[in-house]
Amino acid sequence: MKVSAALLCLLLIAATFIPQGLAQPDAINAPVTCCYNFTNRKISVQRLASYRRITSSKCPKEAVIFKTIVAKEICADPKQKWVQDSMDHLDKQTQTPKT
C-alpha cells in the first residue's frame, strides 16, 4: 500500500510539469506521446522553434506538437490553417542553409 501511495504521489508531481493537453510516454508500454486537447490561441511563428507530428494509432487524434523558443510544448490541431502555415514556415527555415 505504501508503494502505491508513493507511486501516486510521484505521478501527481510529474503531472504538474506536463504541458496542457499532452500525455507523456508510458514507460510500461511502447513510448507514445498523445495530445488530448488543442490550443485555440494562435501563436506566431516568431515563438516556434520546431514541431513534430503525432500520427500514432494509439492516440485519440492526430496532432502537431510545437516546441517554442523557451522549450515549452504546445498541442495544436493540424487541420487549422495557422498550424499548417507554421509547419510550412518551420520546414522552409530548416531547409534554408545558414550563411
Epitope: Q20, R41, S44, V45, Q46, R47, V70, I74, W82
Partner: antibody, heavy 119, light 113 residues
Framework: QVQLVQSGAEVKKPGASVKVSCKVS????????MHWVRQAPGKGLEWMGG????????MYAQKFQGRVTMTEDTSTDTAYMELSSLRSEDTAVYYC????????????WGQGTLVTVSS | DIVMTQSPDSLAVSLDERATINCKSS????????????LVWYQQKPGQPPKLLLY???IRESGVPDRFSGSGSGTDFTLTISSLQAEDVAVYYC?????????FGQGTKVEIK
Amino acid sequence: QVQLVQSGAEVKKPGASVKVSCKVSGYTLTELSMHWVRQAPGKGLEWMGGFDPEDGETMYAQKFQGRVTMTEDTSTDTAYMELSSLRSEDTAVYYCATDDFWSGYFDYWGQGTLVTVSS
Amino acid sequence: DIVMTQSPDSLAVSLDERATINCKSSQSVLYSPNQKNYLVWYQQKPGQPPKLLLYWASIRESGVPDRFSGSGSGTDFTLTISSLQAEDVAVYYCQQSYFTPWTFGQGTKVEIK
C-alpha cells in the same frame, strides 16, 4: 483586425476593488492572448499579467500576485482585470493589449482606463 | 526577471537631425538557433496607447516610416530616428519579448531642440 474597447474611468477608495473590462471585436477572445499593462501618471509601462498560450494559463507579474485576477467571458468576447486592496500607488491608466498571433509583444491596445485611487 | 534599462531618460534633438536611444537587457534576448533578438520598440504619444514600431530588434512594423531603424544584438540595442520630424515627439520604450514576465525599459522622452 483586432479592436479593443475598454470600460470608462473609475474613482475608488483605498482598500476597494476595481474591475476593468475590455471588449474584443474582429476576432474571438479565445483566439487571442489578452494581457494587461498599466501606466502610472508620468511613469513607464508595467506588465501586470495575461494569458500565456505556451503555458495554457494566465500568468501574473509577481508584484500583483494575489491581488489581481484576469478573467474572460467568451460568450461576450470580453476580458476583465480585477485589482483588489487598492492603494494610492495603483492610480494609473490600465490597458488591455494583445496580438492576433501571440508573439510576446503587443500590436493592439485598448484606449486605456484611468483608475484613480483617492480617499 | 530580465531588467531593461534605457538611456538617456530624455533627449532634445533638432528637426531633421538624428536621435539615438539605447536599451540594455540584463541577460541576452538572442535565440541562437534562428539568430533573432527578441526585442521590440514602441512609441507612445501623450494621451495615446503605445504603438509598435519594431520587432526582432530591427524589423519595422508595417506602416512605420523608414527613418526608424533598430540595431544591436544580445544585450545591447539601439533605436535610431535618422531625421527627426515634429510628429516623432513621444516617449519610446523597449521591451524584451523572450521570457515571461514581459519587461519594459523605463522610457526615453524625445523632444525637439
